[in-house]
């Protein structure tokens, strides 16, 4: 059986720009080592914004100034990616690849729509 | 080039254009009148790399990033190594798409 | 595999190559376009997404384990020899090759 990866369809950013969704894969194979990247569609252009690679049992870790975050579970992955505003509203696809032991695997979920509103600016009070 | 049976070869692919170090690089050779057969490919950073199970063991692919090159150690050549052998990039969303490749690169084993 | 291995089209045609996986490989199939002498060309990635730059009159589609790529109308630049390869797991394979001639 093929690799599948689920994640939600459409999630909502928080009004501080913060949008966590859950990407989950079917592994066809007994992993050790496993490489999740987040990618954004827009305008049929396609631009990573952020990876990190795991070992099974051990924390997600993304570089420093990356603007996602993440834990793991077993084949469950937790991402939250913050600092977003309305102009990153898109096409956020996560990507799963299985990097050792060999054979290499790779699964592509279909995407979850991350709509950000922009918050109104507070009116001045007198 | 021509080289002997069972002699070594090393192959280079220098890249432009691109940022090199963001890309998995592949080889994919052709013998002549056949076919494409995937050889090779190296993960952006050179942590990952893996072969076709017709070279393991016997080729070895390298990338120097400061150099913006690529490159294929072929060790115990023979005969059916002969062929038009191609570097290409990994694609950004599917790092086995080859979505750039190089002219080529005609090696011959022969005695 | 890849079917047919050759075929005799005219300009104008309607074209259609399939490639059919030993495994499972969901939808993790790609298309090139490789003329004599020269380096292939990417055409399609993910059974059918086109890559920019490549013609609308050609479209994919499939997944696991039968696909097809379609040239909708044969121009004279699309005489060529068309691969598939697989891009799910190592090793990443390539079909025969589908070499399209002038009938």
């Known amino acids: 059986k093929a690799m599948h990866v689920a994640q939600p369809a459409v999630v909502l950013a928080s009004s501080r720009g913060i949008a966590s969704f859950v990407c989950e894969y079917a592994s066809p194979g007994k992993a050790t080592e496993v490489r999740v990247t987040v990618l954004r569609q827009a305008d049929s252009q396609v631009t990573e914004v952020c990876a990190a690679t795991y070992m099974m049992g051990n924390e997600l870790t993304f570089l420093d100034d990356s603007i996602c975050t993440g834990t793991s579970s077993g084949n469950q992955v937790n991402l939250t990616i913050q600092g977003l505003r309305a102009m990153d509203t898109g096409l956020y696809i996560c990507k799963v690849e299985l990097m050792y032991p060999p054979p290499y695997y790779l699964g592509i979920g279909n995407g979850t729509q991350i709509y950000v509103i922009d918050p109104e600016p507070c009116p001045d009070s007198d | 080039g021509v080289v002997q049976p069972g002699r070594s070869l090393r192959l280079s692919c220098a890249a432009s254009g691109f940022t090199f170090s963001s890309y998995g690089m592949h080889w994919v050779r052709q013998a002549p009148g056949k076919g494409l057969e995937w050889v090779a490919v190296?993960?952006?950073?050179?942590?990952?790399?893996y072969y076709a199970d017709s070279v393991k063991g016997r080729f070895t692919i390298s990338r120097d990033n400061s150099k913006n090159t690529l490159y294929l150690q072929m060790n115990s050549l023979r005969a059916e190594d002969t062929a038009v052998y191609y570097c290409?990039?990994?694609?950004?969303?599917?790092?086995?798409?080859?979505?750039?490749w190089g002219q080529g690169t005609t090696v011959t084993v022969s005695s | 595999t890849q079917s047919p291995s050759s075929l005799s089209a005219s300009v104008g045609d309607r074209v259609t190559i399939t490639c059919r996986a030993s495994q499972n490989i969901s939808r993790y199939l790609n298309w090139y376009q490789q003329k004599p002498g020269k380096a292939p060309k990417f055409l399609i990635y993910v059974a059918s997404i086109l890559q920019s730059g490549v013609p609308s009159g050609f479209s994919a589609s499939g997944s696991g384990p039968d696909f097809t790529l379609t040239i909708s109308s044969l121009q004279p630049e699309d005489f060529a020899t068309y691969y598939c390869?697989?891009?799910?797991?190592?090793?990443?394979?390539f079909g025969p090759g589908t070499k399209v001639d002038i009938k």
């Open positions: 290409a990039r990994g694609a950004v969303v599917v790092p086995a798409a080859m979505d750039v």
């Open positions: 190296i993960w952006y950073d050179g942590s990952h790399k």
């Open positions: 390869q697989q891009s799910y797991s190592t090793p990443f394979t």
